[in-house]
């Protein structure tokens, strides 16, 4: 069950066990009002492990549109602007929560779903396996 | 109004206008069953723009624990293992959706919230501003 002391103004709920259904207001509150001015959307081009953004749309998911990163190269860009294959461009992945319509096509009924998305790429030193 | 051709098995919903309240099953479905074996949790150490992970906990949020990346250096690690300040380590940020208890402390009532999280770091060429 849930551990939080109940606010007397909470909606009633019959079943308080997992798995449980909760009410969610889809009017999104944006906590990023003081968006960091340093935050840049051009890192994908300026990175030594640059990436492209691919559009993924699924109308049964909330959010329906997710932009995913795909690394442009296997290696990393060196100081001369060439790809250095002694280093590796790898995707940084994150598990995020999305809402999945359940049953399908229902406007007001969802289930939480965990998906893995690639957010960008970073340059790493490869793991070298030495053969005896 | 709502856009989806209604599945006859959908729960009823009186108000279909924005903002709207929907029902969400919190029994998380994990779509990442075929998790990529290449997915690595040690990139934060091997990256030329390494980062530390900081735990952020908020019991009024779902998920209550989020791990955030903070770049270790202003510069990037070069081939000699030293920090090169001619390059910049920058956080890759992503807007994600979380559930915020509303009213506070309610176990079964939430509002969607958008937050900005740093997922990892990447090494970028700096933007140089030339002064005339």
């Amino acid at each position: 069950g849930i551990t939080i002391p109940r606010n007397p103004g909470c909606p009633n709920s019959e079943d308080k066990n997992f798995p449980r259904t909760v009410m969610v207001n889809l009017n999104i509150h944006n906590r990023n009002t003081n968006t960091n001015p340093k935050r840049s959307s051009d890192y994908y081009n300026r990175s030594t492990s640059p990436w492209n953004l691919h559009r993924n749309e699924d109308p049964e998911r909330y959010p329906s549109v997710i932009w995913e990163a795909k690394c442009r190269h296997l290696g990393c860009i060196n100081a001369d602007g060439n790809v250095d294959y002694h280093m590796n461009s790898v995707p940084i992945q994150q598990e995020i929560l999305v809402l999945r319509r359940e049953p399908p096509h229902c406007p007001n009924s969802f289930r939480l779903e965990k998906i893995l998305v690639s957010v960008g790429c970073t340059c790493v030193t490869p793991i070298v396996h030495h053969v005896a | 109004g709502i856009t989806i051709p209604r599945n006859p098995g959908c729960p009823n919903s009186e108000d279909k206008n924005f903002p709207r309240t929907v029902m969400v099953n919190l029994n998380i479905h994990n779509r990442n069953t075929n998790t990529n074996p290449k997915r690595s949790s040690d990139y934060y150490n091997r990256s030329t723009s390494p980062w530390n992970l900081h735990r952020n906990e908020d019991p009024e949020r779902y998920p209550s624990v989020i791990w955030e990346a903070k770049c270790r250096h202003l510069g990037c690690i070069n081939a000699d293992g030293n920090v090169d300040y001619h390059m910049n380590s920058v956080p890759i940020q992503q807007e994600i959706l979380v559930l915020r208890r509303e009213p506070p402390h309610c176990p079964n009532s939430f509002r969607l919230e958008k937050i900005l999280v740093s997922v990892g770091c990447t090494c970028v060429t700096p933007i140089v501003h030339h002064v005339a």
Epitope: Y44, L53, H54, Y62, S64, V65, W67 | -
Partner: antibody
Framework: EVQLVQSGAEVKKPGSSVKVSCKAS????????IHWVRQAPGQGLEWIGV????????FYNQKFDGRATLTADKSTSTAYMELSSLRSEDTAVYYC??????????????WGQGTTVTVSS | QIVLTQSPDFQSVTPKEKVTITCSAS?????IYWFQQKPDQSPKRWIY???ELASGVPSRFSGSGSGTDYTLTINSLEAEDAATYYC?????????FGQGTKLEIK
Amino acid sequence: EVQLVQSGAEVKKPGSSVKVSCKASGYTFTDYEIHWVRQAPGQGLEWIGVNDPESGGTFYNQKFDGRATLTADKSTSTAYMELSSLRSEDTAVYYCTRYYRYESFYGMDYWGQGTTVTVSS
Amino acid sequence: QIVLTQSPDFQSVTPKEKVTITCSASSSISYIYWFQQKPDQSPKRWIYATFELASGVPSRFSGSGSGTDYTLTINSLEAEDAATYYCHQRSSYPWTFGQGTKLEIK
């Protein structure tokens, strides 16, 4: 009130470029993608591509790939469409339209007033 | 690419008449969208996700269909409905529009 206000009409020479702006107001700019559609005189509608102001992602109709460049400036809530190597067939009204990223069923709900681009020598 | 073919291209109709515009897709699609455009105006979203009327659209309009065949119906035409109507698909890239159906009031 949601508004998408586009820049004024342009007359361009063949081979040159044009950049059309689309200033958004009345909503959270990064919650919506900006799509661009054009309409040649007396013709139908043609989708050019999409820009996501949040991530910087772009996707183009292959017909325009390499010639069209879609960008956005989050600080001013303005989207841009640049079309290069202009030819007479690019004479058209260019529209920007928004598209809700969270629930795509709503489709392209608000449109700019359109920008007439005339390509003539 | 998916080609959307509207029928008819042009229709001259008497007020109070029932009007049916069809949109046929070259491949199966999930949903159709309809836009109304009047001369020297931007397109207006009219029907979305096949069935749903956009805000402010009169209830005499309706949308239906599935797969490759979709319909916009006006069950009792009024003078203000004179316009060009475009169907639109976004099930497959590139997103495409029908060639348009121009409705004229007799």
